[in-house]
């Protein structure tokens, strides 16, 4: 909006404010059992892992932030199965943690985002 | 789980990831016009603020994060009102932004997050 | 008030390139995507594509792919649209547009006739 | 490519008369955000495009109440209740819901 009519630092503020909102890889918490799409008789210690995934504003309202580059981080986590038939084993979870980000007009065909090895 | 099983080490960067992931304020992207509950009528700019929300994980899947302490941030924002008629108008928003987290069983009764001034 | 200035018209050979500009002025560039559109002599409206200022994102008609570049100067709140290997079919008026939140196109520029011929 | 048709495609209309545009898509344009992104331009002769709805039944700033748009789903309606003389001209629907953005082929709005 022209600046004119305001305080150009007023608008210097409101536009840093939007820079910080716009759609970028931004740390989130991520349940690991639900990603994996595991049953209810696996989880894991911890549940949660935190990764980068993409999040954040677009310029239009039918715009969604997708992630556009990938890579793919290993998290050692107990893996433990109830009933309990033997000790909490120790296994690597690879988990996606989004490096690129786009305002895209459709979701991708494959959202998969956990990869376990 | 026993430490005589693992590596102090990574149990220990297991522990610290854990920690991360818990139940804390976060910094969030929220959108301004669907949190104020406005018509399409009502746009601002911009449409989306940065502030504090509560996120991550319990201990119990039962268990939801949930904020017990807020404080309300006031943002200044363009509010724009369509059809145009007159200069868009810089108005104080304020936000809510979470200052203490939870798990708790159930959710609030009033998740009132802005108010107009 | 929001202003979009094209450049002047321009005058190609088939197999030639062109690259038409945009200035915008009366808000802030980066807040919303720029898209350009196109329409033939007394024909229809036909989208090229747009770009997101802030990062230079760009998302292209794949009609036009491989043919198009969009970018922009945000130091001088300035679009640009390049058409490569021009042919005669892409004589017309090309217009750069400010898309609003809700996805309208809700201010244009006057246009650029474009002239390919030979 | 989503296919927007509109009808008619011209429309001979006495002065102080109403108008109606029909415009209908090829598939829904509906966002998976339950929001509809379709909009209506007007062009006069020898003018740019300019924006009269937004999101089916939104009036731009500026434009008069007695333009009027409608619609869900695949089916859209452009209203003018009274037309004036500076309402000749061509009247696009165009969709942002999907990638391309299309626009439909054009109503040319003429005094009888």
């Known amino acids: 909006f022209a600046a004119t009519f305001y305080d150009i630092e007023t608008l210097k503020v409101i536009d840093e404010e939007w820079q910080r909102t716009q759609c970028s890889p931004r740390e989130t918490c991520v349940e690991v059992a639900s990603e994996l799409g595991k049953s209810t008789n696996t989880f894991f210690k911890p549940p949660c892992v935190n990764v980068f995934r993409c999040g954040g504003c677009c310029n239009e309202e039918s715009l969604i932030c997708m992630n556009t580059s990938t890579s793919y981080i290993s998290k050692q986590l107990f893996e433990i199965s109830v009933p309990l038939t033997s000790v909490p084993e120790l296994v690597p979870v690879k988990v996606a943690n989004h490096t690129g980000c786009k305002c895209l007009p459709t979701a991708p065909r494959h959202p998969y985002s956990i990869i376990r090895r | 789980f026993a430490a005589t099983f693992y590596d102090i080490e990574t149990l220990k960067v297991i522990d610290e990831e854990w920690q991360r992931t818990q139940c804390s304020p976060r910094e969030t992207c929220v959108e301004v016009a669907s949190e104020l509950g406005k018509s399409t009528n009502t746009f601002f700019k911009p449409p989306c603020v940065n502030v504090f929300r509560c996120g991550g994980c319990c201990n119990e899947e039962s268990l939801i994060c949930m904020n017990t302490s807020t404080s309300y941030i006031s943002k200044q924002l363009f509010e724009i009102s369509v059809p145009l008629t007159s200069v868009p108008e810089l108005v104080p928003v304020k936000v809510a932004n979470h200052t203490g987290c939870k798990c708790l069983p159930t959710a609030p009764r009033h998740p009132y997050s802005i108010i107009r001034r | 008030q929001v202003q979009l200035v094209q450049s002047g018209a321009e005058v190609k050979q088939p197999g030639a390139s062109v690259k038409v500009s945009c200035k915008a002025s009366?808000?802030?560039?980066?807040?919303?995507?720029m898209y350009w559109v196109r329409q033939a002599p007394g024909q229809g409206l036909g989208w090229m594509g747009y770009?997101?200022?802030?990062?230079?994102?760009?998302t292209y008609n794949q009609k036009f792919k491989g043919r198009v570049t969009m970018t922009t100067d945000t130091s001088t709140s300035t679009a640009y649209m390049e058409l490569r290997s021009l042919r005669s079919d892409d004589t017309a008026v090309y217009y750069c547009?400010?898309?609003?939140?809700?996805?309208?196109?809700?201010?244009w520029g006057r246009g650029t006739l474009v002239t390919v011929a030979s | 490519d989503i296919v927007m048709t509109q009808t008619p495609l011209s429309s001979p209309v006495t002065l102080g008369q109403p108008a109606s545009i029909s415009c209908r898509s090829s598939?829904?344009?509906?966002?998976?955000?339950?929001?509809?992104?379709l909009h209506w331009l007007q062009q006069r002769p020898g003018q740019p495009p300019r924006l009269l709805i937004y999101?089916?039944?939104n009036r731009f700033s500026g434009v008069p109440d007695r333009f009027s748009g409608s619609g869900a789903g695949t089916d859209f309606t452009l209203k003018i209740s009274r037309v004036e003389a500076e309402d000749v001209g061509v009247y696009y629907c165009?969709?942002?819901?999907?990638?391309?953005?299309?626009f439909g082929q054009g109503t040319k709005l003429e005094i009888k």
């Open positions: 547009a400010r898309t609003s939140y809700y996805g309208g196109m809700d201010y």
């Open positions: 009366g808000y802030t560039f980066t807040g919303y995507n």
């Open positions: 770009i997101d200022p802030y990062n230079g994102d760009t």
């Open positions: 598939q829904s344009l509906v966002h998976s955000n339950g929001n509809t992104y």
């Open positions: 999101k089916v039944s």
């Open positions: 165009s969709q942002s819901t999907h990638v391309p953005r299309t």
